[in-house]
């Protein structure tokens, strides 16, 4: 069964800057990745970035840099200033549309006991929804 993992890390150098890493553990090819915060995309969450293998990447503030790490994982750096900046308990969600398997989404947040610069290992997060 495909799984999605989500890792959230606060940068030690910029305490209000976050890095979100997400990956897809499945056999299909990724057709779209959507990163949101505040809940799942389409369920009250706000889209931060969308990554498409051919057409490229779109990102919206406070997203600073979204990129593909591998064919099945992505990373997103968030700016940490301004009213729309994330806080320590913000939930981030990643939805992977895989062809032809379908869509899989998981969410994660900063581990409660994390020191800046540290993070939990990128273990699979609970799958919230599989379309």
């Amino acid at each position: 069964t495909p799984e999605v993992w989500v890792q959230v890390r606060m940068e030690a150098t910029e305490l209000s800057s976050f890095t979100i890493r997400c990956g897809f553990l499945g056999s299909g090819s990724i057709s779209l990745v959507t990163v949101s915060w505040g809940g799942p995309n389409g369920a009250g969450g706000t889209t931060l970035a969308v990554l498409h293998p051919e057409r490229g990447i779109r990102q919206w503030a406070p997203a600073r840099q979204a990129r593909w790490e591998t064919q099945s994982s992505i990373s997103l750096i968030l700016e940490g200033s301004g009213a729309s900046s994330p806080c320590a308990n913000t939930t981030f969600c990643c939805k992977f549309a895989s062809f032809p398997e379908g869509s899989w989404e998981a969410c994660g947040s900063l581990p409660p006991s994390s020191d800046p610069g540290l993070s939990a290992p990128p273990t699979p997060a609970p799958i919230l929804r599989a379309d």
Partner: antibody, heavy 118, light 107 residues
Framework: EVQLVESGGGLVQPGGSLRLSCAAS????????MHWVRQATGKGLEWVAA???????YYPGSVKGRFTISRENAKNSLYLQMNSLRAGDTAVYYC????????????WGQGTTVTVSS | DIQMTQSPSSLSASVGDRVTITCRAS??????LGWYQQKPGKAPKRLIY???TLQSGVSSRFSGSGSGTEFTLTISSLQPEDFATYYC?????????FGGGTKVEIK
Amino acid sequence: EVQLVESGGGLVQPGGSLRLSCAASGFTFSRDDMHWVRQATGKGLEWVAAIDNAGDTYYPGSVKGRFTISRENAKNSLYLQMNSLRAGDTAVYYCAREGQWPYGMDVWGQGTTVTVSS
Amino acid sequence: DIQMTQSPSSLSASVGDRVTITCRASQGIRNDLGWYQQKPGKAPKRLIYAASTLQSGVSSRFSGSGSGTEFTLTISSLQPEDFATYYCLQHNSYPLTFGGGTKVEIK
């Protein structure tokens, strides 16, 4: 209500220039990719240009180097500067929004007519 | 560039008929395809995106299917307001390309 209104069309001689405008309202213009699509009389649709929310631009080979798409987010406006116009550029030009990237254009303007003729 | 071949280029049908229009991509585009309806003198209207997702506010008699290189738009029961020209659009990669169109006429 999401609305797109094109203007700037008209008659121009071959080799001439024209600048089309598209006024957007009813949505957060700066977030969305925007496109120009044209249609010659009795013909099909042809994608002409796109600009993303970061200002990066995309063109097909048929207009590359002659047409320039741009946007002014503060004015909720999209533009198409057309240079070195040819008779084959005669068409209705539509401005369109891609509101849910990357799923294609979801809202279109009513179009503005460009005629290239001597 | 990805070529989109649409067929038929025109068809005649009666109210109540089931109508099927096909679009073939010159290379695989997964499900990155939309369908548009255009009436004379009007701007195109999106019916379907991502091959099978119905645009909000569009009648459920329209449906889309397919993936990879073969796609289909089906009108389950043709209504008088459905007589129009239909186009497919691949939104997989630049340059975006449309099919040549299918004109649905009254028999």
